[in-house]
Interface confidence: medium
């Protein structure tokens, strides 16, 4: 807390202008007024104020806006940003892109601090979904923002927001997230030809399932085996030595490097071993010829 | 990146007027009070006007008061330097410079003389 | 406006510590904490080097360092290099205006 003192004769600060760097906190304190700092905030940015001095300011904000900053002082906090606590942020109404891009730039180059998340999930609740634009923006920003969201949250992306997503906005998700993204992937890109298709889609694939899987073994798209790798164990396995083989096309190959790495290696299991030796990759560990074939699934399922 | 171009200076005779003009880019000038400077050959440097970023206030060094005029054009990122009855002690390199206090982006300079 | 008061020369053998004094008045060094250093090479414009008395802008190496006592400012360049010979000017605001030292050369020996 500053204590309250009376502002030296000539101090009184007329305008938010750089002389305010010379000023003690107690100065600060006592020769700004918070209604004319809230007008001029813009300007606080193009001046270099110390940390403790921009804890004055921000105090004399609170003060101000004890139930939060109105927009109009939020688009320009600028590095006053940096003090704010996620407490003080849950406080605020922010509705404009802008208000949010002006934020994240300040943090911009560092990792998604608390009080930028809070900041993300207040506009996001305030707008009901996560639009294409709020996702454009964030994406710009954070690209890894997208699998930092709950399946939950997921859900409430509409699928034409998938257009904004690039595939290194998904490197960090996990194969729940993909599953709720898949599908939205689908439906945004379904009217696309083959080739764009798959170019469009492959990111999503880890939450592909095995009928989808099979139908793009039918279109030559050649996968590649970074995004094999990525698919769920679950949709692989039911695949075929020839859906496995088309799907691939002349990836095919890298199957031998990671035979002992799932999917690929669960996948080898389920597979007859005269089928993989068609594929003359050495590869081994299929069941052996002669043996039966029992669908453990099915027979549950029945019983 | 960030920069400030004098220009206008050169060879005035005493009594005669020059206009000096300094543009700035790479930052939000109109955000940024802004300052000459000006350093006489061989000697050291001199303040001589600073203005505001609104433009709402002016100082002058007493050497230069009712004969200098500072202003600036926002939407045009420049500042100004119109110099009346200009004498032989104002020869001298002028810079300008940003801010109003301290100045930490400096033009090159732009010589002015005055002589007969 | 009344310059502020800087020796004409110092100087300095390679890593040793200068300092350089600026003496005002009650009105202008004294007043405030709005005193700032600068660094200027023959022949090019000058370079902000400490501004509010101590402060450094990035950039500017931590070899350069600044302090005040009553209507004195002082600059200490310490592990002097090569690079530093240059004239060095303090400045400070004065009621509504800026006064400039007469400039310091740093010689280095």
């Known amino acids: 807390e500053v204590e309250k003192t009376a502002c030296p004769s000539g101090k009184k600060a007329r305008e938010i202008d750089e002389s305010l760097i010379f000023y003690k906190k107690w100065e600060l304190e006592a020769c700004v007024d918070a209604a004319l700092l809230a007008t001029q905030m813009d300007r606080v940015n193009a001046i270099p104020f110390t940390y403790e001095q921009l804890d004055v300011l921000k105090h004399k904000l609170d003060e101000l806006y004890p139930q939060g900053y109105p927009e109009s002082v939020i688009q320009h906090l600028g590095y006053l940003f940096l003090k704010m606590s996620p407490e003080d942020i849950r406080k605020w109404n922010v509705t404009s892109l802008e208000t949010l891009k002006a934020l994240l730039e300040v943090n911009k180059g560092h990792e998604m601090s608390p009080q930028v998340a809070t900041l993300i999930d207040r506009f996001v609740k305030g707008r009901g979904q996560l639009d294409k634009d709020t996702l454009d923006t964030l994406t710009a920003f954070y690209p890894g923002y997208l699998c930092s969201l709950s399946p939950e949250e997921l859900s409430s992306v509409p699928p034409s927001s998938i257009w904004a997503v690039r595939p290194q906005d998904l490197d960090t998700c996990d194969p729940r997230q993909l599953d709720v993204l898949y599908p939205k992937a689908r439906l945004a890109f379904q009217n696309m030809n083959g080739s764009e298709y798959f170019v469009k889609i492959q990111s999503f694939l880890g939450g592909a399932p095995t009928e989808d899987l099979k139908a793009l073994s039918q279109q030559n798209v050649s996968m590649d085996l970074a995004t094999f790798m990525k698919l769920r164990t679950d949709a692989v396995l039911p695949l075929t030595v020839a859906e496995v083989q088309k799907l691939l096309g002349p990836h095919v190959e890298g199957l031998k490097a990671e035979e002992r790495h799932r999917p690929v290696r669960d996948w080898i299991l389920r597979q007859r071993q005269d089928d993989l030796d068609t594929l003359g990759l050495g590869l081994q560990g299929g069941i052996p010829n002669g043996y039966l074939v029992l669908d453990l699934s099915m027979q549950e399922a029945l019983s | 990146q960030v920069q400030l171009v004098e220009s206008g200076g050169g060879l005035v005779q005493p009594g005669g007027s020059l206009r000096l003009s300094c543009a700035a880019s790479?930052?939000?000038?109109?955000?940024?009070?802004m300052s000459w400077v000006r350093q006489a050959p061989g000697k050291g440097l001199e303040w001589v006007s600073g203005?505001?970023?609104?433009?709402?206030?002016?100082y002058y060094a007493d050497s230069v008061k009712g004969r200098f005029t500072i202003s600036r054009d926002n939407s045009k990122n420049t500042l100004y330097l119109q110099m009346n009855s200009l004498r032989a002690e104002d020869t001298a390199v002028y810079y300008c410079?940003?801010?109003?206090?301290?100045?930490?982006?400096w033009g090159q300079g732009t010589l002015v003389t005055v002589s007969s | 406006d009344i310059a502020l008061t800087q020796p004409a020369s110092v100087s300095g053998a390679p890593g040793q510590r200068v300092t350089i004094s600026c003496t005002g008045t009650?009105?202008?060094?004294?007043?405030?904490?709005?005193v700032t250093w600068y660094q200027q090479h023959p022949g090019k414009a000058p370079k902000l080097m400490i501004y509010?008395?101590?402060k450094r802008p990035s950039g500017v190496s931590n070899r350069f360092s600044g302090s005040k006592s009553g209507n004195t400012a002082s600059l200490t360049i310490s592990g002097l290099q090569a690079e530093d010979e240059a004239d060095y000017y303090c400045?400070?605001?004065?009621?509504?205006?800026?006064?400039f030292g007469g400039g310091t050369k740093l010689t280095v020996l």
């Open positions: 410079a940003r801010y109003l206090y301290y100045f930490d982006v």
């Open positions: 790479g930052f939000t000038f109109s955000s940024y009070g």
């Open positions: 203005i505001s970023y609104s433009s709402s206030a002016t």
């Open positions: 009650s009105s202008d060094v004294g007043a405030s904490d709005t």
């Open positions: 509010a008395v101590n």
């Open positions: 400045a400070s605001r004065d009621s509504s205006s800026m006064v």
